[in-house]
């Protein structure tokens, strides 16, 4: 689903307050509710009628340093007999997320929100078809 | 997908430096990629075998100030004849995102990390069953 | 202006050969996956073909799979359908089609004008 634009108001104090100095914000350290977890179906990645793999990118300046990314492993859907229908479509689900990027310079450290799209996994469609018009 | 603990380390300066002040660091106004735009399947909740609604929830402190959750509408999955299908299972996807958590004190403002668990979509599995032993 | 011309069809006896072709223009063929479906009479659409764009990843409905071919000539930007031990249940109309998008799957397909009517009789 789609983040909207910040359009940086979010970001700024009150219209009543001194500006923000030298464009940076306060973030404090720590991350609420850290230790929630995905309680996802086990397998869901192959047992799933629109199977996908995974592949894991990895960047040590980025939180979380993981982004796991899932690639629809058909075109069609695996039917009942374990057959791939191409009458059906796997499509990816993509999510937007935001990751940290932390920018550094000697000891300066600074950090900034970075939108990244992910796929997350693969769902069985009907396909849609448009008819192109001959004039 | 899980985002590993930070352990905190991603946000401290490198040993040799000064620790950061009063637990907090610096983050830059704007946001990286975020023209970035999610390129997904028109209709899908409604297209899928496991198709799924949207509930919207929308909080002014935080950044997205909208987040989207994915419902499962179904138990089955939808089958070529338009029939819910319980030998197979719609079940959600779910992803661990994170979001910006402003706080502010009159002209004080500081921000902070949420993890947020997103049910992103649904897919259609063959369901697993387990043995229970009799002893 | 995306256009999808087939050709190639017509009567042929069971057990026969037919080789459809499809002209496309208005759109990059050579980045597209490109389609072969059919309606047969008072039936929807079935799809039974699927060819990568480039021409590795093949598809295959099982009704068809070992008697029909696909295949492409990017530089023509042309689409084949070689159909070999043909049956009367392969009457039909049939159609080329491309992905809606380019690069990213959605289920979305543009498919094209006529067809070409294929029918199987003794």
């Known amino acids: 689903r789609k983040i909207p634009k910040v359009g940086h108001t979010f970001f700024q104090k009150p219209e009543s307050c001194p500006p923000v100095p030298g464009g940076s914000m306060k973030l404090d350290i720590g991350i609420i509710n850290e230790n929630q977890r995905v309680s996802m179906s086990r397998n869901i990645e192959s047992r799933s009628t629109s199977p996908w793999n995974y592949t894991v990118t990895w960047d040590p300046n980025r939180y979380p340093s993981e982004v796991v990314q899932a690639q629809c492993r058909n075109l069609g859907c695996i039917n009942a007999q374990g057959k791939e229908d191409i009458s059906m479509n796997s499509v990816p689900i993509q999510q937007e997320t935001l990751v940290v990027r932390r920018k550094h310079q000697g000891c300066s450290v600074s950090f900034q929100l970075e939108k990244v799209l992910v796929t997350v996994g693969c769902t069985c469609v009907t396909p849609v078809i448009h008819h192109v018009q001959h004039h | 997908r899980k985002i590993p603990k930070v352990g905190h380390t991603f946000f401290q300066k490198p040993e040799s430096c000064p620790p950061v002040p009063g637990g907090s660091m610096k983050l830059d106004i704007g946001i990286i990629n975020e023209n970035q735009r999610v390129s997904m399947s028109r209709n899908i909740e409604s297209r899928s075998t496991s198709p799924w609604n949207y509930t919207v929830t929308w909080d002014p402190n935080r950044y997205p100030s909208e987040v989207v959750q994915a419902q499962c509408r179904n138990l089955g999955c939808i089958n070529a004849q338009g029939k819910e299908d319980i030998s197979m299972n719609s079940v959600p996807i779910q992803q661990e995102t994170l979001v910006v958590r402003r706080k502010h004190q009159g002209c004080s403002v500081s921000f902070q990390l949420e993890k947020v668990l997103v049910t992103v979509g649904c897919t259609c599995v063959t369901p697993v069953i387990h043995h229970v032993q009799h002893h | 202006e995306v256009q999808l011309v087939e050709s190639g069809g017509g009567l042929v006896q069971p057990g026969g050969s037919l080789r459809l072709s499809c002209a496309a223009s208005?759109?990059?063929?050579?980045?597209?996956?490109m389609y072969w479906v059919r309606q047969a009479p008072g039936k929807g659409l079935e799809w039974i073909s699927a060819?990568?764009?480039?021409?590795?990843?093949?598809y295959y409905a099982e009704s068809v799979n070992g008697r029909f071919t696909i295949s492409r000539d990017n530089a023509k930007n042309s689409l084949y359908l070689q159909m070999n031990s043909l049956k009367s249940e392969d009457t039909a109309v049939y159609y080329c089609?491309?992905?809606?998008?380019?690069?990213?799957?959605?289920?979305?397909?543009?498919?094209g004008g006529q067809g070409t009517q294929v029918t199987v009789s003794s």
């Open positions: 060819l990568a764009p480039g021409g590795g990843n093949r």
């Open positions: 208005g759109f990059t063929f050579s980045s597209y996956w």
């Open positions: 089609a491309k992905d809606h998008n380019v690069g990213y799957r959605t289920g979305e397909y543009d498919y």
